[in-house]
Every structure is written in structure tokens, then in C-alpha cells.
């Protein structure tokens, strides 16, 4: 259905009053042409008196015919005032004004609340030339009006440089009442009170509001929007909305679950990342947050070792990224591992433990007694040390890791080898006469390189020097020995 | 949001006149038309006119035809109401007020209170 | 012109009463579009009027729903539920349907 809005052409007007033509204008025209009641007002004025009217839908030409008579003023014809009409109704409107022959070119645009109206909108204008005098009527039409198309309507022409301007057309769009404010999910402390707020506007207004829990109404008297519901408390899951009622009828917001807090359940899937010696990287998929959000969670970790104490190792972090890494374990070590989260209301369980076992370590002590001599007749270094006290979880031991750096005149080299497990010696050239050699030693396993022995100082002087009594590791208190016979 | 400010109060002799401005803003000014009312102490309130700003238009309560004049400046946003030959009976307080989308005068201004006294 | 006529002059009511106002028209403020453009006011001391509802039986914006008209054609009626304090004031009707525009002469809430 098309509200459709014409022109006056009774001498009362079609809307309210004299907004637009209910009464003749308070000047009448320059001339006296024939015209409906319904025109404009025309401001009266002296033909000869320059300058442009006062009222500015108004222009006066200042062409004058053949027989030099003045023409009449313009002004758009009165139209409608103001429709009133549901949402989704269309609606068409016009404005319309008689102008002589002798202007060409003359165009009409719509503006609403100030702003033109350009583009997607049904605007017509037509033409119905005459000996003297064109009509020109623009049509401005609405498909479906939305409650954003409430607003003041006119038309402007632009004519000689003057804008003539019509009166306006209001329209008022009504409908059933339109939500600003929907309740709004929530996840609450049992047994405790919460608010939830529902407004919704017309027109037409008032809105009323009636509330309904697990579709019963919850108020017997509605409230004028904008309500606000105080639950007291709830023990378990419940669905809210609310109904706004207008005169157009009733629109029903969306239903919002309010959910009871309560502790995590436990996270699930703990696995293992990566496993060194000393640390074991795990993830976890968090378990459902009973509805409030994890702050922190907590590692839990114990020896899997039946000879052990039993006693908990425990790690808090942050519930975020879900992934931890454990330090200070024990190498080649079996463990369990578990993992639990907490929110606002408390601890979830603990996940299903996961066993987990470190690596072998790196040695954690130095070959002992290191000792090194020249052999000069062989031109070697001789070096001695015994094995260190490996423990079981530092691994199998697999050899040593021999460092010599020789320093000489401002020159410096570092030399590294390797040698099998089974030894406690080794024999190493000499590189460089008249020279410092310093040694150091660490035992090596499949998990690494353990720490070097303290160093121990040779000199090895030019060719034809005396032999040697043996360099050996520095007893506590001596820093860096060199003993040179 | 609507606003409509009017200009302060106005102590006149008789036969001056005066001219009372009511600034507009919020709103298109130049899309929705502006009346005036005429409120007497103790007494009831008197529609005196309108203006369109758009187009200058008006239209008058024929009691008031020659008494007032109304005016729109849209550059300002502000309407005015000029009152001419005053006497006491022209002492009041004189408001203007907004036409809305409702077709009712929806935002009225503070009023502007006008003594004609010798 | 459209006379109103509004009764009564004052009315005393207690707070938490039910008040009525009564507005009558000497013409028929029903325009041809079916609409009736008749409109309530409340003015509290020293302020300007407010609207309270607009044709016949539309609350404004923020209205409390104490407040509720009704009428057709001549007759009109404004009644609020229950009076507060901040009610009282001196109410007035407006027709817009007829140029020139009339109010009511007004009535005053005030407490017994």
C-alpha cells in the first residue's frame, strides 16, 4: 500500500492546519493570477522596488514579457504537511510550482533535515509545458520506509540565481517498537542478584515492557521502557527476554542465556612439547571455564620412581598460552605429571596424569686430578686424570673433551680433541716452543659436555732445555699454577 | 540534542520595540518551523505565529498581525520576534518553541521575559 | 477560532491520587487524515512548558507512564495515574488542527 499525498486543492488542508495552506497567505501577489488557495505565500512588494524578496521561496523575475508586464512571484503549491504511516509502507510525496516559459533549464532536488538527497531514491520530476507557463511537479517516493526516513522534507529549485523553497512535509514513521538496548548474556555467582536492562523505542511511544523467564512473564504490570530487571538470584541455567509493546503491537527481543558459574572442569590432553635434561615443555587443552573466566593454573609434577619420597613438585603459571615449561628436573628421570586450572569460584580437578622423562644430563663434574708433562724426547704433551664421579642420571659416559690453548708472544690458539671413554690419558704434539700450554679436560655423554676441569699451565721452552717435572691440577687457593723447571 | 537558548530579559518604554532572538541548535534548523507564544503573568498561553526558516515563510495569529514580525537567520541558526508600539499589555514572557516530526511544538526555549514600563 | 475549555480551573489533589483533567474543543480537532492534533503541556513554576502528550493519547519521549490521554473529535481527557510531587504545575491542551493555534486557559495540580 502507497500513502500517496497530494497537492490542496480544498480550502481546507489535507494535514494539520496551516502547515501548509489552511489559510490564505498574509500578502497576496504582485498580480492578480488565478491560482489555488493552496499556493505559497507570495511577499508583496513594488515591481519597480530592486533587491530580492524577504521570503525566500519567493522570486520575483525580473524578465518582463513583450508587453513588459512583470511576471508573478514563484512558490512551490502547498502540499501535504505531515504524514503519519507504518514501517515497510511506501509513501509517495510531491512538490510542485508553475514557471514561466522563459526559464530554462530550471531543476528541483530533495533535501531531508538539511542534507540533499542524492542518489538511491525514487525522485520524478515532470514537465507539463503550457503557452506561458511549465508545471513542474517532483514526486519523491519511499518503497518501504525504515524509521531512518522520519524527517523534514522540501524541495528547493534553483531559478535567475534565487533558490525558491517549499514549505516542509514531515514524516513521521511509526512501527512496532524498535530494541536500543537488549539484555545481554551473562554468567553469574549463584544465588547472587544481577541486573539486566531492556529498552525500546517507537513511535509510536509509550513502549511497555514485560519480562519473561523460561517463557513465563516475570512482571504482571509492564514497565515503560527504558526496565530494568533485578533477579535476585538464580541456582541454575535460565533464559531471559523481554516484550516492548506500542500501539503498532509487540516485538520480542532475543532470548539470553544467564549461566550459573562454577569450577573448571579439568583440563585435558597434557602432552609433551620437548624434553631436555633438566625441563620438560607441556602443553594442555584447557577444559570448559564453568562459565568464568581461568586466572591461573597449576603444574603438578611427582617422581615416578617407586623408590621415591612421593613428595609434589608444584608450578603455577598463567592460564594463557596453555603451555608451560618445567625446570629444575632431574635427568634421565621418569615423572608424573598433571595439570589443574582455576577461575573465580575455585580449582578445577586435575587432569589425567601423563608420565614424562628427562633426558640423560650432561656430566655435572669434572675430570679429577688432572696432571700434564713434557716428554721432550717425544716432542709431546702428556696429560693424565681420572674418570669423574659420573651419576646415574647424568648417562653413560663417552668420552672427554681435551682443550689446549697455546699463547706465545701475543699469539693464542685453542685446540680441541676427543677422546673414547676408556682411557685416562692422552698425548698430545706440541704446537708451539717457547710457549704457555694451558689444559683443560671435561667428560662428555650423550647428553653433552660436562664442565672443564680447572686449567693447568706448562711452559714448554726452546729445544734443548732440561726434561720436566709434571704440571697438575692447582690445589684449592691456587689460581692459575705454572710450574717450569 | 534540541536546544532553543532565547536572549535575556528586556526592560522597554512604550511605544519602542524590541527584538528577542531564539538561537537554535541540535536540529536542522532550516527543516522544522519555529513558533512563538505569548504567556502573560498569571495568565494562559497565546499563540502568536510561525516561521519556516527554509523559506522565510510565516503566518500569523491575526491578533498579532502588525505586532510582531517574525525572522530567521539561517547563517546563525537563530529566529527572532520583533515586537513593535509597545504597551503594557505587551508585558509577558514570550517563547519560542519547535514544530516537530510529531507535529506538536516538541522543544521549547527558556522564554524571554519583556517589561514595557515608563 | 477553536475555543478550548478546560476544567477544572485548580485541582487540589493528596499524592499517590488519581487526577483528571478534562479539555473540550468548540470544533472538531479531527483533521481529514484521520489524525486529531491535540496536545498536552505541563509548565512547573518557572520553567516553560513541557510536552507530556502529543495527539490525544501518544506519550513523549520520557514521559512517565502515569500519564495517559484520551478523547476523539471534541472531548479530551488526561489523567494521571498517580500523583507525585514533582507533578504539580498548571497543565495545558493545544490544538494545532485550526489556525490560529489556542491552548487551554489551564488547569493547576496543586496538593490538598
Known amino acids: 500500500a502507497i500513502t500517496e499525498a497530494r497537492e490542496e486543492a480544498k480550502p481546507y488542508p489535507l494535514f494539520p492546519g496551516p502547515f501548509p495552506g489552511s489559510l490564505q497567505t498574509d500578502h497576496t501577489p504582485l498580480l492578480s493570477l488565478p491560482h489555488a488557495s493552496g499556493y505559497q505565500p507570495a511577499l508583496m512588494f513594488s515591481p519597480t522596488q530592486p533587491g530580492r524578496p524577504h521570503t525566500g521561496n519567493v522570486a520575483i523575475p525580473q524578465v518582463t514579457s513583450v508587453e513588459s508586464k512583470p511576471l508573478p512571484p514563484l512558490a512551490f503549491k502547498h502540499t501535504v504537511g505531515h504524514i503519519i504511516l507504518s514501517e515497510h509502507k511506501g509513501v509517495k510525496f510531491n512538490c510542485s510550482i508553475s514557471v514561466p516559459n522563459i526559464y530554462q533549464d530550471t531543476t528541483i532536488s530533495w533535501w531531508k533535515d538539511g542534507k540533499e538527497l542524492l542518489g538511491a531514491h525514487h525522485a520524478i520530476t515532470q514537465f507539463y509545458p503550457d503557452d506561458e507557463v511549465t508545471a513542474i511537479i517532483a514526486s519523491f517516493s519511499i518503497t518501504s520506509v525504515q524509521r531512518s526516513d522520519n524527517g523534514s522534507y522540501i524541495c528547493k529549485m534553483k531559478i535567475n540565481n534565487e533558490e525558491i523553497v517549499s514549505d516542509p512535509i514531515y514524516i513521521e514513521v511509526q512501527g512496532l517498537p524498535h530494541f536500543t538496548k537488549q539484555p545481554e548474556s551473562m554468567n553469574v555467582t549463584r544465588n547472587t542478584a544481577f541486573n539486566l536492562t531492556c529498552q525500546a523505542v517507537g513511535p509510536p511511544e509509550p513502549v511497555n515492557i514485560f519480562w519473561v523467564q523460561n517463557s513465563s512473564r516475570v512482571n504482571e504490570q509492564p514497565e515503560k521502557s527504558p526496565s530494568v530487571l533485578t533477579v535476585p538470584g538464580l541456582t541454575e541455567m535460565a533464559v531471559f527476554s523481554c516484550e516492548a509493546h506500542n500501539d503498532k503491537g509487540l516485538t520480542v527481543s532475543k532470548g539470553v542465556q544467564i549461566n550459573i558459574k562454577a569450577i573448571p572442569s579439568p583440563p585435558t590432553e597434557v602432552s609433551i612439547r620437548n624434553s631436555t635434561a633438566h625441563s620438560i615443555l607441556i602443553s594442555w587443552v584447557p577444559g570448559f571455564d564453568g562459565y568464568s573466566p581461568f586466572r591461573n593454573c597449576s603444574i603438578q609434577v611427582k617422581e615416578a620412581d617407586p623408590l621415591s619420597n612421593g613428595s609434589v613438585m608444584i608450578f603455577n603459571t598463567s592460564a594463557l598460552p596453555h603451555l608451560y615449561q618445567i625446570k629444575q628436573l632431574q635427568a634421565l628421570a621418569n615423572y608424573s605429571i598433571g595439570v589443574s586450572c582455576m577461575n573465580e569460584i575455585g580449582w578445577s580437578a586435575v587432569s589425567p596424569w601423563i608420565l614424562a622423562s628427562t633426558t640423560e644430563g650432561a656430566p655435572s663434574v669434572a675430570p679429577l686430578n688432572v696432571t700434564v708433562f713434557l716428554n721432550e724426547s717425544s716432542d709431546n704433551v702428556d696429560i693424565r686424570w681420572m674418570k669423574p664421579p659420573t651419576k646415574q642420571q647424568d648417562g653413560e659416559l663417552v668420552g672427554y673433551r681435551i682443550s689446549h690453548v697455546w699463547q706465545s708472544a701475543g699469539i693464542s690458539k685453542e685446540l680441541l680433541e676427543e677422546v673414547g671413554q676408556n682411557g685416562s690419558r692422552a698425548r698430545i704434539s706440541v704446537q708451539v716452543h717457547n710457549a704457555t700450554c694451558t689444559v683443560r679436560i671435561a667428560a662428555v655423554t650423550r647428553g653433552g659436555v660436562g664442565p672443564f676441569s680447572d686449567p693447568v699451565k706448562i711452559f714448554i721452552p726452546a729445544h734443548g732445555w732440561v726434561d720436566y717435572a709434571p704440571s697438575s691440577t692447582p690445589a684449592p687457593g691456587n689460581a692459575d699454577p705454572v710450574l717450569i723447571i | 540534542q534540541v536546544q532553543l537558548q532565547q536572549s535575556g530579559p528586556e526592560l522597554v518604554k512604550p511605544g519602542t520595540s524590541v527584538k528577542i532572538s531564539c538561537k537554535a541548535s541540535g536540529y536542522s534548523f532550516t527543516s522544522y518551523y519555529i513558533h512563538w507564544v505569548k504567556q502573560r503573568p498569571g495568565q494562559g498561553l497565546d499563540w502568536i505565529g510561525w516561521?519556516?526558516?527554509?523559506?522565510?515563510?510565516?503566518q500569523y495569529n491575526e491578533k498579532f498581525k502588525g505586532k510582531a514580525t517574525l525572522t530567521a537567520d539561517t547563517s546563525s541558526s537563530t529566529a527572532y520576534m520583533q515586537l513593535s508600539s509597545l504597551t503594557s499589555e505587551d508585558s509577558a514572557v514570550y517563547y519560542c518553541?519547535?514544530?516537530?516530526?510529531?507535529?506538536?511544538?516538541?522543544?521549547w526555549g527558556q522564554g524571554t521575559s519583556v517589561t514595557v514600563s515608563s | 477560532d477553536a475555543v478550548m475549555t478546560q476544567t477544572p480551573l485548580s485541582l487540589p489533589v493528596s499524592l499517590g491520587d488519581q487526577a483528571s483533567i478534562s479539555c473540550r474543543s468548540s470544533q472538531s480537532l479531527e483533521n481529514s487524515n484521520g489524525h486529531t492534533y491535540l496536545h498536552w503541556y505541563l509548565q512547573k513554576p518557572g520553567q516553560s512548558p513541557q510536552l507530556l502528550i502529543y495527539?490525544?493519547?501518544n506519550r513523549f519521549s520520557g514521559v512517565q507512564d502515569r500519564f495517559s490521554g484520551s478523547g476523539s473529535g471534541t472531548d479530551f481527557t488526561l489523567k494521571i495515574s498517580r500523583v507525585e510531587a514533582e507533578d504539580l504545575g498548571v497543565y495545558f491542551c493545544l490544538q494545532v488542527t485550526h489556525v490560529p493555534f489556542t491552548f487551554g486557559s489551564g488547569t493547576k495540580l496543586e496538593i490538598k
Open positions: 516561521i519556516f526558516p527554509g523559506n522565510r515563510n510565516t
Open positions: 495527539r490525544v493519547s
Open positions: 518553541a519547535r514544530l516537530g516530526l510529531i507535529y506538536a511544538l516538541d522543544y
